[in-house]
């Protein structure tokens, strides 16, 4: 299907940290389409090449993913069809951090949103009762 | 402010070899890819080279393959691309830019001339 | 390689004219398009990419549009100091191939 540029839907992101070694989830989600074929999710990290993930036509398409991310990324494939394009990032690493964009095509438009990624070696506030 | 600055251009000969260097501020510059585009005088722009971030990945035009390689120092800001077995229509001054998402380029350098003549 | 092919090669316009300039992919790019304007002895400017998003300082009288192989660059009020050389470039696999520019001249 084709997209012009007149069309645009909401995309938004939330601003999220994560912890170097472990897995880090990278928020994000837009107004849902009838059918998962006409969803396009796109993330892209700003100064990197290539795609950090792909997900078209109800399956992740991982051709043009850069070098840094193989292997690594994910999206939450059941919850695409109600709008979430939450990408999962397994064992995260202090390069991740950065800006991130959300992009997102669906039969209606398209539309993107960016979120800042912070990796850091974070610990839990412990708590005394 | 981001900033770029490239150097060593000059007057070459045909076959002849040249490195040129891209140095890089204001930006963490190991997150970035980078890229060197060319004018020939009087000509539209033509992509050369690119390289990722890390430097493990590295691209070329047709016309520059196995001639040309792209490099970069991190630790030292630095964005080269070696310039062998030079010919007349490699006359240009050469770009570098920064990618900004995918391979769109935001900023470039002020540029500098390559003259291979004999 | 991917083929960009830019029309009309060049211009002649007014201050306040709405400006159209076309930039056809030989092969599906998707929206990975981006503009640049380049003025005499001067590097380019990056406008816009992902063919209608505006490079943050850019004016608003500049938008981008379409997707897979056709794409448009549109100047809505030509302004004084937008008389430069536009180029197209596709940014979705190497090499990233450049349009061969469009020169606006002044009327």
């Known amino acids: 299907f084709g997209i012009s540029g007149r069309h645009s839907i909401t995309v938004t992101t939330v601003a999220s940290a994560g912890n170097i070694g472990e897995d880090g989830i990278l928020s994000c989600t837009f107004e849902p389409d009838i059918k998962l074929s006409d969803i396009v999710i796109q993330w892209l990290k700003e100064g990197v090449l290539g795609l950090v993930h792909e997900f078209k036509e109800g399956k992740d398409e991982l051709s043009e993913q850069d070098e840094m991310f193989r292997g690594r990324t994910a999206v939450f494939a059941d919850q695409v069809i109600v709008g979430n394009a939450s990408l999962r990032l397994k064992n995260v690493q202090l390069t991740d951090a950065g800006t991130y964009k959300c992009y997102i095509i669906t039969s209606k438009g398209k539309g993107n949103a960016n979120l800042e990624y912070k990796t850091g070696a974070f610990s839990m506030p412990e708590v005394n009762v | 402010e981001v900033q770029l600055l490239e150097s060593g251009g000059g007057l070459v000969q045909p076959g002849g070899s040249l490195r040129l260097s891209c140095a890089a501020s204001g930006f963490t510059f190991s997150s970035y890819g980078m890229h060197w585009v060319r004018q020939a005088p009087g000509k539209g722009l033509e992509w050369v080279s690119g390289i990722s971030g890390s430097g493990g990945s590295t691209y070329y035009a047709d016309s520059v393959k196995g001639r040309f390689t792209i490099s970069r120092d991190n630790s030292k800001n630095t964005l080269y691309l070696q310039m062998n077995s030079l010919r007349a229509e490699d006359t240009a001054v050469y770009y570098c830019a920064r990618t900004q998402w995918r391979a769109s380029l935001d900023p470039w350098g002020q540029g500098t001339l390559v003259n291979v003549s004999s | 390689d991917i083929q960009m092919t830019q029309s009309p090669s060049s211009l002649s316009a007014s201050v306040g004219d709405r400006v159209t300039i076309t930039c056809r992919a030989s092969q599906d790019i998707s929206y990975w398009l981006a503009w640049y304007q380049q003025k005499p002895g001067k590097a380019p400017k990056l406008l816009i990419y992902?063919?209608?998003t505006l490079q943050s300082g850019v004016p608003s009288r500049f938008s981008g549009s379409g997707s897979g192989t056709d794409f448009t660059l549109t100047i809505s009020s030509l302004q004084p100091e937008d008389f430069a050389t536009y180029y197209c470039q596709q940014t979705t696999m190497s090499p990233y191939t450049f349009g061969q520019g469009t020169k606006v001249e002044i009327k």
């Open positions: 992902g063919a209608s």
